[in-house]
Interface confidence: medium
């Protein structure tokens, strides 16, 4: 039949060439002379001329050695034609399979591989994978099947078989326990790849295995015992720095120390933190220490790492003996702030209170007292007993020194220690109100029309507290009630002043007496300007003009001047008399008002 089975040809054949492979034969050669030819890649197309055919015999020829790694299979077509060139057979498939020879060594993908593994891991832990390739066939033969092995290990600590390599995958694993980064941080493995599944050609490479740090070293105190001296009462005082060493990687969680006070600090006086750079434990006072209560503290401090220990490790403990240094402590007022109720205006020399301090020190020190700040100068303090007495008039209404009824005084206590120390206390005097102020109207000057006048509403103020204030009562005195009326409103906090009779344009004094709920009376003179106008007015219109029936003669002018001069003289006489009479009337009220003003100015 015009059929050829696949032809297998080994690569790298030694010849001689051309080498006969197979004969093409058409059974049509009985009838006519047949000529054979081949076409396809390797025959008449690239790579040309690898194969040929003897035209008349049909022998398929190989002209040169084959390379499977270049072309593993050739697909040609055989042709048969008669003498006249007519095709006598259909083109025939000729498959030439190039069989593999082990003509390539394995090649590692890198000369040096790097990998890493945590120290102290268990045998079987994977480290890294290496790869070697072989161009030879690994499907039908073992020529390209690579087997991996470890040729050598450096260093050989703790022994020379710390790692193994999977012979077919190239995965390097830990085979023995004992990897210790602190002893050997890096291993060099010379690895081999051998084809023929371990029986053929060998190539080598290097695998560097870095041993990574695990927290397999506990921090250790150096030294383990400390002694420190701390002055009493100081908060935030650095007591001691505790030093540890740790063989793990600096600045890693396996190296960074965490400190805990595990004993000796029942009063929660101390705290310990880790210094971010030195890794030391910084022991400080959280509260002030009290020499008188306890002059020595023995602390037990434990150190661990931020990261948990990778293996079971002992925890280091340090002892810190803290000696408390005695300090002359300041006397302390009891209470630090004392509130005392006292009536305003008490007599000079009257006792206010006793305010004393205690000295925390064990020695019976003498304490002396004095006033440190007394803004109004109202008080004195006995240096031995701490007795506070009044030396001025305590005035609740004195707004310069009293706030919300409270007068604040700062007192000082000093011991006789060496050096002496002082403590301060605050005395808060709550001043109890006394009805020492009468009601006062506001404003004290009014302007009013003498025709259809508008009622004048005056506010009433009283510096005292209830019940020494409203309701108020009003009364007009010194004949002011002839022309005026004064009424207190329903709420009792304003007074309404009204003009009840015509008064010519002029300024008048209205004598108004106001009394509070506690009958404290206050006389006030209201200056009333009466204007020639109707209804409401702010200021009087222009000067008042009298009528004149005269013409324009000189005699008339002289007459007018004479009248004006007489009027002026008469007016002066009347004013003097009137003034004397008013002085006599209002002297008592004005003196009292001046007294009030004088006190206000002093304040």
């Amino acid at each position: 039949d015009w059929v050829v089975a696949p032809i297998s040809v080994p690569e790298n054949g030694k010849g001689p060439f051309p080498q006969r492979l197979n004969q093409l034969k058409s059974n049509k050669d009985r009838d006519t002379k047949i000529f054979y030819s081949i076409t396809g890649p390797g025959a008449d197309s690239p790579p040309e001329g690898v194969f040929a055919v003897e035209k008349e015999t049909g022998w398929l020829l190989l002209n040169k050695p084959l390379d499977r790694e270049e072309i593993a299979k050739y697909e040609l077509f055989g042709h048969a034609v008669s003498e006249n060139g007519a095709s006598v057979e259909d083109p025939m498939n000729i498959s030439i399979i190039v069989t593999d020879q082990n003509d390539h060594k394995p090649k590692f993908t890198q000369d040096t591989f790097r990998g890493s593994v945590l120290e102290g891991v268990l045998p079987g832990t994977s480290v890294m994978q290496v790869t070697a390739t072989d161009e030879d066939d690994a499907i039908y033969t073992y020529n390209g099947v690579v087997a991996y092995s470890i040729h050598s290990q450096e260093p050989k600590d703790p022994h020379d078989l710390m790692f193994t390599i999977h012979r077919s995958t190239g995965t390097i694993s830990v085979i023995s326990s004992g990897l210790d980064r602190e002893k050997v941080p890096e291993y060099t493995l010379t690895i081999q790849a051998t084809d023929m599944d371990g029986d053929g050609s060998t190539t080598t490479a290097v695998a560097v295995v870095e041993i990574l740090d695990a927290n397999d070293n506990a921090p250790m105190f150096e030294p383990q015992k400390y002694e420190a001296w701390v002055p009493e009462n100081e908060v935030g005082h650095e007591v001691q720095r505790l030093t540890v060493t740790d063989l793990d990687v600096p600045n890693s969680p396996a190296w960074r120390a965490t400190y805990h006070i595990v004993g000796g600090d029942d009063g929660d006086h101390f705290t310990i933190t880790t210094h971010p750079e030195t890794n030391q434990g910084v022991l400080t006072t959280k509260k002030g220490l009290d020499f008188e209560a306890q002059d020595q503290h023995t602390l037990y401090v434990e150190v661990t790492n931020e990261a948990p220990f990778a293996v079971k490790l002992p925890t280091a403990t340090a002892t810190v003996v803290v000696h408390v240094k005695d300090v002359n402590e300041a006397p302390v007022f009891v209470p630090p702030s004392k509130v005392v109720e006292v009536q305003e205006g008490i007599p000079t020399g009257e006792p206010v209170c006793v305010y004393t301090a205690e000295d925390p020190d064990k020695e019976n020190q003498k304490i002396s007292y004095r006033i440190l700040r007394d803004p109004a100068g109202w008080l004195a303090m006995d240096p031995d007993s701490g007795q506070v007495t009044a030396v001025g008039t305590l005035d609740r209404e004195d707004e310069q020194f009293v706030r919300n009824n409270i007068y604040e005084v700062m007192v000082l206590a000093m011991d006789n220690g060496s050096p002496p120390t002082t403590g301060t206390g605050t005395l808060l005097l709550t001043l109890i109100d006394v009805n020492d102020h009468g009601p006062v109207p506001e404003p004290r000057q009014i302007t009013i029309c003498n025709q259809s006048p508008v009622r004048q509403v005056l506010n009433i103020t009283d510096k005292d507290l209830s019940p020494h204030t409203s309701p108020f009562q009003a009364q007009l005195t010194d004949d002011s009630d002839i022309y005026w009326t004064a009424e207190v409103n329903e709420e009792g906090d304003t007074v309404v002043l009204s003009l009840k009779k015509f008064l010519k344009q002029d300024t008048y004094d209205v004598h108004l007496s106001l009394s509070d709920h506690g009958n404290k009376e206050q006389l006030t003179v209201i200056r009333a300007t009466v204007c020639d106008c109707h209804g409401h007015v702010e200021t009087c219109p222009g000067p008042w003009k009298g009528g004149s029936g005269g013409g324009g003669s000189g005699a008339g002018v002289i007459a007018v001047i004479v009248v004006v001069v007489i009027a002026i003289v008469a007016g002066i006489v009347v004013l003097v008399i009137s003034r004397k009479k008013r002085m006599a009337k209002y002297e008592k009220a004005e003196i009292k008002e001046m007294g009030e003003m004088h006190r206000e100015l002093n304040a």
Epitope: Q110, D111, T112, R114, S116, E154, P155, D157, D180, R181, E182, K183, V184, P185, E186, T188, V206, V208, E210, D213, L247, V249, P250
Partner: antibody, heavy 123, light 113 residues
Amino acid sequence: VQLLEESGPGLVTPSQSLSITCTVSGFSLTSYPINWVRQPPGKGLEWLGVIWTGGGTNYNSALKSRLSITKDNSKSQVFLKMTSLQTDDTARYYCAKSRGVYDFDGRGAMDYWGQGTTVTVSS
Amino acid sequence: ELVMTQSPSSLAVSVGEKVTMSCKSSQSLLYSSNQKNYLAWYQQKPGQSPKLLIYWASTRESGVPDRFTGSGSGTDFTLTISSVKAEDLAVYYCQQYYSYPYTFGGGTKLEIK
């Protein structure tokens, strides 16, 4: 100040052994690895080996069979021993401190070197 | 072992000039896990021991003047001196610490014209 100082015999006869001591100050051998490097006259540098903080060693494979590096942490001394010297071992021998013990420190880089000690192998 | 090749073996420059020298490794010194190149540069002045200039291929050692710059990655590395001073007369070595044994280049001798 970190200092390294080598001390050696100066002259060694062929086939004999060489012992060099490197004494360090300013740092601890428990914190930093120490390398040995040599330089033949007028030539380049050749790394011989390293001793790690925990006492482990790595050697140049070409010289491994003849080299031994040990140390005494308490004395701050590192020792190089080399056997079967030949004339081509004539060189200036340096000890050099690694930048650190960890890979991320660049531990293969050497930041402090001794002044070196000259070793001449001659009969 | 890894082979380090430096070029040129020597060069002469005038003070103030910029100079570059090359170092090639027989395989990549870049470790993919940390993206670092395991290469150092040293300066050895006549009669002195070597001095570390650069590590991790481009990190300048403390105290080294900033005119010294290291660059490159993989297999090709360069040391540049931006403006040469008379005191820079020395032999410059590169060194790989990617794989054992650590190996040095043959050196580049810098001479001043």
